[in-house]
């Protein structure tokens, strides 16, 4: 079951999935000036079973000039942003699939992909929060949110995180110093999390985010 809502907004924080539950969809979208190849996939899907999951299909983009189905509307500001080259060059950390049954790792980048990835999360997905650059965690309960189904409706649990404006950046679970595990989280759970280095921190995300359905993407 897909989650109808976005994960909660935390001022001065952004979130990240460490791994994606089976059933998660990732839109195959291309950056400005590019389109999917003819007969290309609309989305990637995390498929499999409890023992092994992987992304089905591949996203492929081609120059709009080579296709005549290219009616480009005026791009929104977020479409015009360029990915940091360091993001694209940063290698993914390996994932032990066996320790994450029913989950997929972060898909590798594809050539000319859109600036921001749009995921469709499913019930049971967990995302982790981090204070943005320039803020640190003042209060730290579980800095995570889970999409749950209650009374036939999906909802995200509220993460216990407050970010305060001091020049110190809190870390994602798995990015802590080796000797420190996240409060309230068993070491075994921490150790099976994916660590990726290509996550784009959107410093403007939480505090100014509109509540419109059509405003922002999962990131």
């Amino acid at each position: 079951e897909l989650c109808d809502d976005d994960p909660p907004e935390i001022p001065h924080a952004t979130f990240k999935a460490m791994a994606y539950k089976e059933g998660t969809m990732l839109n195959c979208e291309c950056k400005r000036g590019f389109r999917r190849i003819k007969s290309g996939s609309l989305y990637m899907l995390c498929t499999g079973n409890s023992s092994h999951s992987s992304w089905d299909n591949q996203c492929q983009c081609t120059s709009s000039a080579t296709r005549n189905t290219t009616k480009q509307v005026t791009p929104q500001p977020e479409e015009q942003k360029e990915r940091k080259t360091t993001e694209m060059q940063s290698p993914m950390q390996p994932v032990d699939q066996a320790s994450l049954p029913g989950h997929c790792r972060e898909p590798p980048p594809w050539e000319n992909e859109a600036t921001e990835r749009i995921y469709h999360f499913v019930v049971g997905q967990m995302v982790y929060y981090q204070c943005v650059q320039g803020y640190r965690a003042l209060h730290r309960g579980p800095a995570e949110s889970v999409c749950k189904m209650t009374h036939g409706k999906t909802r995200w649990t509220q993460p216990q995180l407050i970010c305060t404006g001091e020049m110190e950046t809190s870390q994602f679970p798995g990015e802590e110093k080796p000797q420190a595990s996240p409060e309230g989280r068993p070491e075994s759970e921490t150790s099976c999390l994916v660590t990726t280095t290509d996550f784009q921190i959107q410093t403007e995300m939480a505090a100014t985010m509109e509540t419109s359905i059509f405003t922002t993407e999962y990131q």
Partner: antibody, heavy 115, light 107 residues
Framework: QVQLQQPGAEMAKPGASVKMSCKAS????????IHWVKQRPGQGLEWIGY????????EYNQKFEDKATLTADKSSNTAYMQLNSLTSEDSAVYYC????????WGQGTTVTVSS | DIQMTQTTSSLSASLGDRVTISCRAS??????LNWYQQKPDGTVKLLIY???RLHSGVPSRFSGSGSGTDYSLTISNLEQEDIATYFC?????????FGGGTKLEMK
């Protein structure tokens, strides 16, 4: 409850244009596409294209590239499809649908092209 | 484009019957097959996605199966409210394409 609301009918003359709406409610996810699908009387369903409302990113069925233009207004959570240079072949019911699985559909807008 | 074919354009059945509607793709669609129900008033609902997954709120008498190019929708215990036209769709290759529909009627 997820809903996609469409006006019931639109009338237009041959050669004119028509712009129909699809207002989304009942969900706050920003990740969903809005697709548009055409159904001629007594016939099957044809995919026209989709828009990612948050970015304006569009994909079209090549057959409808010169016929349809998809847009969206984020402030009102509404997607639009404009059909131009209308002919009798454009008389049909037009549906909007949500997401990769087309999991929720509007009631459809009946477009009648007649002089 | 991938062609989706529903060879049976209409079929008649009785209440309580087990009904199977088939759909064939012109090439392997790797289980990206969805089923929709269109009621006589035009209302369209998703029933099954990704070949066999039941959409939220859909009665369990509906089920889907298949692989490669051949897929089917089964209604295990036909009810009056199931009178409708059923469309298959391959949903993950541009452009998404629909079958011509199978109209289900009561005997």
């Amino acid at each position: 409850q997820v809903q996609l609301q469409q006006p019931g009918a639109e009338m237009a003359k041959p050669g004119a244009s028509v712009k129909m709406s699809c207002k989304a409610s009942g969900y706050t996810s920003t990740a969903y596409w809005i697709h548009w699908v055409k159904q001629r009387p007594g016939q099957g369903l044809e995919w026209i294209g989709y828009i990612t409302p948050s970015t304006g990113y569009t994909e079209y069925n090549q057959k409808f590239e010169d016929k349809a233009t998809l847009t969206a207004d984020k402030s009102s959570n509404t997607a639009y499809m404009q059909l131009n240079s209308l002919t009798s072949e454009d008389s049909a019911v037009y549906y909007c649908a949500r997401g990769g699985y087309f999991d929720y559909w509007g009631q459809g807008t009946t477009v009648t092209v007649s002089s | 484009d991938i062609q989706m074919t529903q060879t049976t354009s209409s079929l008649s059945a009785s209440l309580g019957d087990r009904v199977t509607i088939s759909c064939r793709a012109s090439q392997d669609i790797s289980n990206y097959l969805n089923w929709y129900q269109q009621k006589p008033d035009g209302t369209v609902k998703l029933l099954i996605y990704y070949t066999s997954r039941l959409h939220s709120g859909v009665p369990s008498r509906f089920s889907g199966s298949g692989s490669g190019t051949d897929y089917s929708l089964t209604i295990s215990n036909l009810e009056q409210e199931d009178i409708a036209t059923y469309f298959c769709q391959q949903g993950n290759t541009l452009p998404p394409t629909f079958g011509g529909g199978t109209k289900l009627e009561m005997k």
